[in-house]
């Protein structure tokens, strides 16, 4: 669960009164003020480990739409445009929090859920190359 | 806010009775069952655009600890270990949901917040601006 700051008057997480269900305000506060508006915009295409973005939609989840990256090549793209198979494209994955409607279709009751998403791809040296 | 499935008996999001505050169960369900256990483990070090991971801690947020990637180089690392400045290491960023205690220190009241995090780095061809 969530670690609660130790304030007097706050039951600790071992306490039977510790809240397993909390109130959450859905008016999302967006902290991304000073970020580069371009962000990862066209990196998916310009990367040496380019990726495609696939739309994953689930109306029982918030956010309902998540974009999943899928690397385009097993190798990495060289300056001449050919694939270098001595290098490997791999997905960079991150665990994110989503809200899952529980019970299903219920508008005001959710459960926190962790899911693993691929955000983009990076080019790595393979662990092993040749056999003696 | 969150788009609600149109079920009979569910007020729509224009309705004044639409819930802006919902109940969320904090017993996290983890969906990462069939994912590759290796995940991004040592990619940060083996990448041609390697990155360091910085711990960002905030007790008023859940998750309280978020790891931020910072690219190690402006350029990308070549096979010989030298940096190629004709290429650029760039962070792959993703918007994620977190829960922010509101009011502060309150254990059972939160607000959804979107924050932008850098998950890792990728090597891209630079956008070249030629001078006429």
């Amino acid at each position: 669960g969530i670690a609660i700051p130790r304030n007097s008057g706050c039951p600790n997480s071992e306490d039977k009164n510790f809240p397993r269900t909390v109130m959450v305000n859905l008016n999302i506060h967006n902290r991304n003020t000073s970020t580069n508006p371009k962000r990862s915009s066209d990196y998916y295409n310009r990367s040496t480990s380019p990726w495609n973005l696939h739309r994953n939609e689930d109306p029982e989840r918030y956010p309902s739409v998540i974009w999943e990256a899928k690397c385009r090549h097993l190798g990495c793209v060289k300056a001449d445009g050919n694939v270098d198979y001595h290098m490997n494209s791999v997905p960079i994955q991150q665990e994110i929090l989503v809200l899952r409607r529980e019970p299903r279709h219920c508008p005001n009751s959710f459960r926190l859920e962790k899911i693993l998403v691929s955000v983009g791809c990076t080019c790595v040296t393979p662990i092993v190359h040749h056999v003696a | 806010g969150i788009a609600i499935p149109r079920n009979s008996g569910c007020p729509n999001s224009e309705d004044k009775n639409f819930p802006r505050t919902v109940m969320v169960n904090l017993n996290i369900h983890n969906r990462n069952t069939s994912t590759n256990p290796k995940r991004s483990s040592d990619y940060y070090n083996r990448s041609t655009s390697p990155w360091n991971l910085h711990r960002n801690e905030d007790p008023e947020r859940y998750p309280s600890v978020i790891w931020e990637a910072k690219c190690r180089h402006l350029g990308c690392v070549k096979a010989d270990g030298n940096v190629d400045y004709h290429m650029n290491s760039v962070p792959i960023q993703q918007e994620i949901l977190v829960l922010r205690r509101e009011p502060r220190h309150c254990p059972n009241s939160f607000r959804l917040e979107k924050i932008l995090v850098s998950v890792g780095c990728t090597c891209v061809t630079p956008i070249v601006h030629h001078v006429a």
Partner: antibody, heavy 120, light 111 residues
């Protein structure tokens, strides 16, 4: 069902060029790579190259760079391979095949092949 | 290029036999994403290759369960538990983690 249709045979003169076709049906053309593979009589299979129909990205085996050029026509879901400077060494059966991307990167469906004969 | 070596070149069998075909690669076929890209095809005379097994051990749709694949690193095996007449032809292994290459083929024929 997934089908890759290729003409049965082509006869061309030495030194000439030829364009082989591969018409895809039964799936979304732009979601899969198209590969080309050469097979000489009684011999093994040689990979020539691949093209991504979604953006026409091509990747060639070093051996066939300069010999083969891969293109697609999205409107007709057809892939093409142009072979130039033909010699008797180019006489072979040429297969097109499709593959998925990344985790699904293997040729799962193949055309019946075009027999190319280079002869005067 | 990665060299794929198949043994034997020719495999005379009787119907109902269990047979194994070996494929060895000159380089390890494990990708950094954890997958091993070694596949098996069957080519019958006058036809195109048909996918049997992908990524070492996964049977392609419609392939009977008498076909199985195993192995890791550089050594791989295709097993047919009970050979049927429809199984005769040339078997190829291939790898797609490097520039794609194919083995030389193993001809399965009746004794």
């Amino acid at each position: 069902q997934v089908q890759l249709q290729q003409p049965g045979a082509e006869l061309v003169m030495p030194g000439a060029s030829v364009r082989l076709s591969c018409k895809a049906s039964g799936y979304t053309f732009t979601n899969y790579w198209i590969h080309w593979v050469k097979q000489r009589p009684g011999q093994g299979l040689e990979w020539i190259g691949e093209i991504d129909p979604s953006d026409t990205f091509t990747n060639y085996s070093p051996k066939f760079k300069g010999k083969a050029t891969l293109t697609v026509d999205k409107s007709s879901s057809t892939a093409y391979m142009q072979l130039t400077g033909l010699t008797s060494e180019d006489s072979a059966v040429y297969f097109c095949a499709r593959s998925g991307i990344y985790y699904d990167y293997y040729e799962d469906y193949w055309g019946q092949g075009t027999t190319l004969t280079v002869s005067s | 290029d990665v060299v794929m070596t198949q043994t034997p070149l020719s495999l005379p069998v009787s119907l109902g036999d269990q047979v194994s075909i070996s494929c060895r690669s000159s380089q390890i076929l494990l990708h950094s994403n954890g997958n091993t890209y070694l596949h098996w095809y069957l080519q019958k005379p006058g036809q195109s290759p048909k996918l049997l097994i992908y990524k070492v051990s996964n049977r392609f749709s419609g392939v009977p369960d008498r076909f199985s694949g195993s192995g890791s690193g550089t050594d791989f095996t295709l097993k047919i538990s009970r050979v049927e007449a429809d199984d005769l032809g040339v078997y190829f292994c291939s790898q797609s983690v490097h520039v794609p290459t194919f083995g030389g083929g193993t001809k399965l024929e009746i004794k």
